[in-house]
Amino acid sequence: EKLPKAPVITTPLETVDALVEEVATFMCAVESYPQPEISWTRNKILIKLFDTRYSIRENGQLLTILSVEDSDDGIYCCIANNGVGGAVESCGALQVKMKPKITRPPINVKIIEGLKAVLPCTTMGNPKPSVSWIKGDNALRENSRIAVLESGSLRIHNVQKEDAGQYRCVAKNSLGTAYSKLVKLEVEVFARILRAPESHNVTFGSFVTLRCTAIGIPVPTISWIENGNAVSSGSIQESVKDRVIDSRLQLFITKPGLYTCIATNKHGEKFSTAKAAATVSIAEWSKSQKDSQGYCAQYRGEVCDAVLAKDALVFFNTSYRDPEDAQELLIHTAWNELKAVSPLCRPAAEALLCNHLFQECSPGVVPTPMPICREYCLAVKELFCAKEWQAMEGKAHRGLYRSGMHLLPVPECSKLPSMHRDPTACTRLPYLDYKKENITTFPSITSSRPSADIPNLPASTSSFAVSPAYSMT
């Protein structure tokens, strides 16, 4: 007969590291006779046998937490007692590890130059994540104006124009990295006149052009006042380049006047205004009387629903204030424009435009948009829509913008990657693959290229003649 033996814990509990939602197991091997009763505590509170979050096996020697939660952190003890000698106890800690998570991501911010901007980035994780920021394509360096706060937020004092751009925060610990979506910091600048109109002394009946140049963010609007009232005659020509607006007021001078250029831009509910004035006097008047980094999300729109794959993950460009609505509006406008094109061209153009405006998101380093393969773009341009494309280019050269494809947001084929160089660098258009399998004859195409140079889509028994000389780089 076996002699009674007080319990001895042969494998003391150790610290266990576990990721959230993973399994964590404590082992408490006990030698004793008779068999002990083993109970478990967490932070000195008894774990109930019927608690479904735990599994207790091997006569109580194995405690398994089936799906670890943040709140499971703590000290776990096993207590073994068989009535011989005293109860014995061994304790170990559960450290819940957590990949970084951005709980309060940054949001788009508009700020007036000179003020302070704060982009939030609150994170969770264990070990505590370090937070850094990326601006555009580069890691953001801290300086006397720019600091990453303890909270992870980015603070920019005395915001300058060059601070504008796309930012994302990066939370990193030993378990992984989390990226926020790109947000836009827009720096607004009060309207300022760079070039004031010049005063003129002219003869009666001559033409004068008054020029006023202003800068600001957003780009200001320029209005003209003549002797305190809105200009009633004359023509105004405006151009905008690099946030500079250039307004030219051409006047037919029949009387003298004071002309004021007013540059205005809006910052939220407030306006900023700058003014400059010039006089136009008439020589010998008394005698005479006589001038685009975004996010990936499922496509929820309607226009491209039949063209894009079901539940397609597509890229939304955050250079638009409301990307999903803005891109849907663009495609909606394009769709109406396509009513004017041929039945051969239209579905191919629809496939091209939908996949260009709503680019497929590819995984990999971080989900990013995949452009259309150059070969498919060229197939639409030079095969399916050759006539329309030629007509469009002809109209563009002659300055005729009326109907057809000229308003469409079409990609520049030469700037797209080739699937022959990297088939994973770009998106194919399944419609075109299907079409080339099923269409046996195409209408004759009058193209600037020889017909043999139609782009090389994936090999099949199609009527696409392919020239090996067709360079796809």
Epitope: L313, C361, S362, P363, V366, R421, P423, T424, A425
Partner: antibody
Framework: EVQLVESGGGLVQPGGSLSLSCVAS????????MNWVRQAPGKGLEWLSV???????YYADSVKGRFTISRDNVKNTLYLQLNNLKPEDTALYYC?????????WGQGTQVTVSS | EIVLTQSPNSVTASVGEKVTINCKSS????????????LNWYQQRPGQSPRLLIY???TQQSGIPDRFSGSGSATDFTLTINSVQPEDAAVYYC?????????FGQGTKVELK
């Protein structure tokens, strides 16, 4: 025809630095993702780094903080700066074109780290 | 990081035989929205650079003989060489392009009798 020609390898002491280059031809370099992959003698392939079309870079943990990938789209050249080299960095270093697959490979340049 | 495990480590076959290599991923490498598996297969002949055989788990790279085919989805993938030829003696690697860091399997050596 796509060509990737690596250079810059050689013998270097532990703790030393090297700069590898890869000259690309036969394709519009700026439109494609580029990678570095290495192979230690008699061992398997190890992916090191990728650089996207906007010059954003990503690294394997084994080289993070020591190696830097960059590109010059004007010169059609991919670079890998290797700092604080260790004997276990001894390998044949390949320059590779590809986004989610490694499509075209160079012939490689040998880096030997030894005292 | 995603771990890829290839089996077997080596295989010896006669010309004309069918060779099957498996690759198991520790996580899904399939994107739900487009159902593509970002799993690639490479061949490395002795003294040569690797070359891409299969991408997206089953799409054959251009210029690759038809005897090479890929199959599988989510976490289990297979490279099949139908009617193996002498020039197929090489090491074959699987690799995932789903999530950085991109990772390779340990390789499978195919030898011919």
């Amino acid at each position: 025809e796509v060509q990737l020609v690596e250079s810059g390898g050689g013998l270097v002491q532990p703790g030393g630095s090297l700069s590898l280059s890869c000259v690309a031809s036969g394709f519009t370099f700026s439109l494609y993702y580029m990678n570095w992959v290495r192979q230690a003698p008699g061992k398997g392939l190890e992916w090191l780094s990728v650089i996207d079309t906007h010059s954003i870079a990503y690294y394997a943990d084994s080289v993070k903080g020591r190696f830097t990938i960059s590109r010059d789209n004007v010169k059609n050249t991919l670079y890998l700066q290797l700092n604080n080299l260790k004997p276990e960095d001894t390998a044949l270093y390949y320059c590779v074109l590809g986004r989610t697959a490694l499509v075209r490979w160079g012939q490689g340049t040998q880096v030997t780290v030894s005292s | 990081e995603i771990v890829l495990t290839q089996s077997p480590n080596s295989v010896t076959a006669s010309v004309g035989e069918k060779v099957t290599i498996n690759c198991k991923s520790s996580q899904r490498v399939q994107l739900g929205s487009n159902q593509k598996s970002y799993l690639n297969w490479y061949q490395q002949r002795p003294g040569q650079s690797p070359r891409l055989l299969i991408y997206y788990a089953s799409t054959q790279q251009s210029g690759i003989p038809d005897r090479f085919s890929g199959s599988g989805s989510a976490t289990d993938f297979t490279l099949t060489i139908n009617s193996v030829q002498p020039e197929d003696a090489a090491v074959y690697y699987c690799q995932q392009g789903y999530s950085a860091p991109f990772t390779f399997g340990q390789g499978t050596k195919v030898e011919l009798k």
